[in-house]
């Protein structure tokens, strides 16, 4: 149900590495120098002033932005909003170092990984075999032939 930060991490690392071909592993191109990264929860404000130096980093805006890894970007990522019209609600609030995690609202489910929206659970006409869960729809009792 929660947002997957593993591929997000790889994506950011890949994008950052493309501009860091001249720097050794773990350092990032900042103007003419190879700089240390900013820590999770912060963004770069100013490049470092010497090779291997530390850039000026500032915190992301709490509750609105996050950054969950070492990086060299001048912007934090914005926090995901759990859209109630997509059947979502907050499971875990956004922190400086972790994006919001969303889950299905009560009476909604999602049966695919990395849910972008949840579907309202079915209501059963002839009784319920298994109740709806966050990951599976209601299993309804079929009408028995003798009642037809």
């Amino acid at each position: 149900q929660g947002t997957n930060s593993i591929s997000e991490s790889l994506k950011l690392r890949r994008r950052v590495r493309e501009t860091d071909k001249n720097c050794s592993e773990g350092l990032y191109q900042g103007g003419p120098f190879c700089c240390q990264p900013c820590q999770p929860g912060k963004k770069k404000v100013e490049d470092c002033k010497m090779n291997g130096g530390t850039p000026t980093c500032a915190p992301c805006t709490e509750g609105k932005e996050y950054m969950d890894k070492n990086h060299y970007a001048d912007k934090c990522r914005r926090c995901t909003l759990c859209d109630e019209e997509h059947g979502l609600e907050v499971e875990t609030n956004c922190t400086l170092t972790q994006n919001t995690k969303c889950k299905c609202k009560p009476d909604f489910y999602c049966d695919s990984p990395g849910c972008e929206h949840c579907v309202r659970c079915a209501s059963c006409e002839h009784g319920t075999l298994e109740p709806c869960t966050a990951t599976s729809n209601t299993n309804c009792r079929k009408q028995s032939p003798r009642n037809r």
Epitope: T3, N4, S7, E8, K11, L12, R15, T61, G63, K64, K75, R77, R78, T80, L81, C82, D83, E84, E85, H86, N99, G114, E116, H117
Partner: antibody, heavy 121, light 111 residues
Framework: QVQLQQPGAELVKPGASVKLSCKAS????????MQWVKQRPGQGLEWIGE????????NYNQKFKGKATLTVDTSSSTAYMQLSSLTSEDSAVYYC??????????????WGTGTTVTVSS | DIVLTQSPASLAVSLGQRATISCKAS??????????MNWYQQKPGQPPKLLIY???NLESGIPARFSGSGSGTDFTLNIHPVEEEDAATYYC?????????FGGGTKLEIK
Amino acid sequence: QVQLQQPGAELVKPGASVKLSCKASGYTFTSYWMQWVKQRPGQGLEWIGEIDPSDSYTNYNQKFKGKATLTVDTSSSTAYMQLSSLTSEDSAVYYCARNRDYSNNWYFDVWGTGTTVTVSS
Amino acid sequence: DIVLTQSPASLAVSLGQRATISCKASQSVDYDGDSYMNWYQQKPGQPPKLLIYAASNLESGIPARFSGSGSGTDFTLNIHPVEEEDAATYYCQQSNEDPRTFGGGTKLEIK
């Protein structure tokens, strides 16, 4: 249904300020950020900024910092945008739009009717 | 800022044919495998109307003749078959990075 109502037009003098309103109905006002967009006559669309009605947090396009100020009144489910030190460059249609989120892709699903601001002496 | 270039600036398509509108971004608008691109339709004197969000998701109530595709820097809006009421200006918009930006628009005329 979800609606965003905006006044049709505002005529203002150069150097003055104007406060545009956007009244929301048909949804929980504090659950969705409000966006503001500018459109000059015969031109494209320009993003001004956004406000989270739940706590009045704002985020502006750098270009409009100092020009636009976004506020909300949750008791009346109304968003406002004040434009200051108006010049002819500010003559445009201004739209409010409700923000939605799909996997952290933010998009504008319902738009106001737009307010035409004319700056003229 | 991310610049979105739409092409063509205008096009005329016969009723029932396919209209294809391109939107190219000055840098990738993808993140974590998702494409942060949206499409809007605007008719004269009206506000824009959402058609497609996140590159390929059709907004509720929009006819299935509208479809979006693409990733990275290249995106496409297709309309097929084109109907009379589709005459409008179409805008792409990216939301991967602030400031959020719009393309310059493509005006569709129905022949």
